[in-house]
Amino acid sequence: MNSFNYTTPDYGHYDDKDTLDLNTPVDKTSNTLRVPDILALVIFAVVFLVGVLGNALVVWVTAFEAKRTINAIWFLNLAVADFLSCLALPILFTSIVQHHHWPFGGAACSILPSLILLNMYASILLLATISADRFLLVFKPIWCQNFRGAGLAWIACAVAWGLALLLTIPSFLYRVVREEYFPPKVLCGVDYSHDKRRERAVAIVRLVLGFLWPLLTLTICYTFILLRTWSRRATRSTKTLKVVVAVVASFFIFWLPYQVTGIMMSFLEPSSPTFLLLNKLDSLCVSFAYINCCINPIIYVVAGQGFQGRLRKSLPSLLRNVLTEESVVRESKSFTRSTVDTMAQKTQAV
């Protein structure tokens, strides 16, 4: 996170009269994972299975369409970011199982968690880009007809990835491997040591650019889209409302704990009780944020087609139907069919 990222098992009271045999645990609790860590492992496992399968299917479907369809470009990039994030999960999983011991070395400590951050921020920023695109389609249809092309879409994606990279650089630069003397353990985390101000600056920038700004973009865009959609009686849809709420709420809910604890930890002394408590919850907050990486395919399926009459079909068949339908896949994560539908017929083949 924003401060040194680790927790340790409770080794209990070490009595001078007892032998400290490092070949065995110091006490029985040392082999027991904390409840937040167990919950994090469960979430990681579910996110990995759903995220890899779901996003792989999205990538497979959208890859064929990406050359000619703008919405396919959005979903391809989004799915790639989520998919790559999910691939890194076994490493986090292994580290938590080993009480946050990091057996992967210094280079892996710098690169792997930074890649995870890169992909997660890319997902957020791409989601904000998609929202902006939805907004333009509804409110600037003529502009879209003239300028909304695949080239511009790829540039927008490149900007999103670039900004994600910028957000990740501090984490990469300050990431170190620390070997604790007792209990013997190698830890991987961010160590700002002498530069608390820089740590706070990184946390604030991350909060604003990686959370508040995309959240604001999503909320404003979808509020205006909803108002426009609902102002047209013929296109009024409770499904649209549900999807918009699902998109914004899931983004907000799953990222909130990570961002709040991150900003709090950057302002707290590492030895303070509050910091230590938040540090124990760190893995759970990260795993909670990771739910964003598998939620998209779920929203595509649930919101895109609804449950009725679809549960009888197999999952691959269901996903194929959802992801290949123009009115669903090519409409945005919000699946607004309203005023966009008529525009879509003119612009989707760009």
């Epitope: 070997e179 604790e180 007792f182 160590d191």
Partner: antibody, heavy 121, light 112 residues
């Protein structure tokens, strides 16, 4: 009372090996780790490594991994440090130290008197 | 490795003065359990070091209360309220949070 009695001064030639000893008394030898520390004349202290006398578990400073070998003999309550392939830079005072602490072996509470090693041709 | 930087290297004092020695670490010494394992030792000429302060601010048994330690993270200070003749020697800071364990170069407390 707790005591760590180290062997006397050593004079060795470059390339040779030497084995320093540290006899513990006044406490249960196998219950406390023994660390070894190097101090060159007019310089600071350098941590070499430690041994857990009960399980013969050792941990070394990477800098001394190929230089020092730590062993312990529970029957005589003695810890040993062998220094190999001696060079002039190995000339120093070597301390054995016992560690303690309420929640782990974090503090050096009892020190030996030190063994002076001189490497000279 | 964690570099422990002590200042000053030499501190001339008069008996009864207050003395202050600083120790800075290149990395945070906060352990994952929340404790900071920073110790202070005093080494008198021709003797082995003796433990004065452990865990930043805790006096070891038998250490007079004129010795006090403070600090957090990477910045630490040892204060001697009224210097006595038996206090003269080299003061060393040391960390046992991270491997390898490291020591400062020492601060020589001497009479003016």
């Amino acid at each position: 009372q707790v005591q760590l009695q180290q062997s006397g001064a050593e004079l060795a030639k470059p390339g040779a090996s030497v084995k320093l000893s540290c006899k513990a008394s006044g406490y249960t030898f196998s219950s406390y780790w023994i660390h070894w520390v190097k101090q060159r004349p007019g310089q600071g202290l350098e941590w070499i490594g430690y041994i857990n006398p009960r399980g013969d578990y050792t941990k070394y400073n990477q800098k001394f991994k190929d230089k020092a070998t730590l062993t312990a003999d529970k029957s005589s309550s003695t810890a040993f440090m062998q220094l190999s392939s001696l060079t002039y830079e190995d000339s120093a005072v070597y301390y054995c130290v016992r560690v303690t602490g309420s929640e782990g072996p974090y503090y050096f509470d009892y020190w030996g008197q030190g063994t002076t090693l001189t490497v000279s041709s | 490795d964690v570099v422990m930087t002590q200042t000053p290297l030499s501190l001339p004092v008069s008996l009864g003065d207050q003395a202050s020695i600083s120790c800075r670490s290149s990395q945070s010494l906060v352990h994952s359990n929340g404790n900071t394992y920073l110790q202070w030792y005093l080494q008198k000429p021709g003797q082995s070091p003796k433990l004065l302060i452990y865990k930043v601010s805790n006096r070891f048994s038998g250490v007079p209360d004129r010795f006090s330690g403070s600090g957090s993270g990477t910045e630490f200070t040892l204060k001697i309220r009224r210097v006595e003749a038996e206090d003269l020697g080299v003061f060393l800071c040391s960390q046992s949070t991270l491997v390898p364990l490291t020591f400062g170069a020492g601060t020589k407390l001497e009479l003016k």
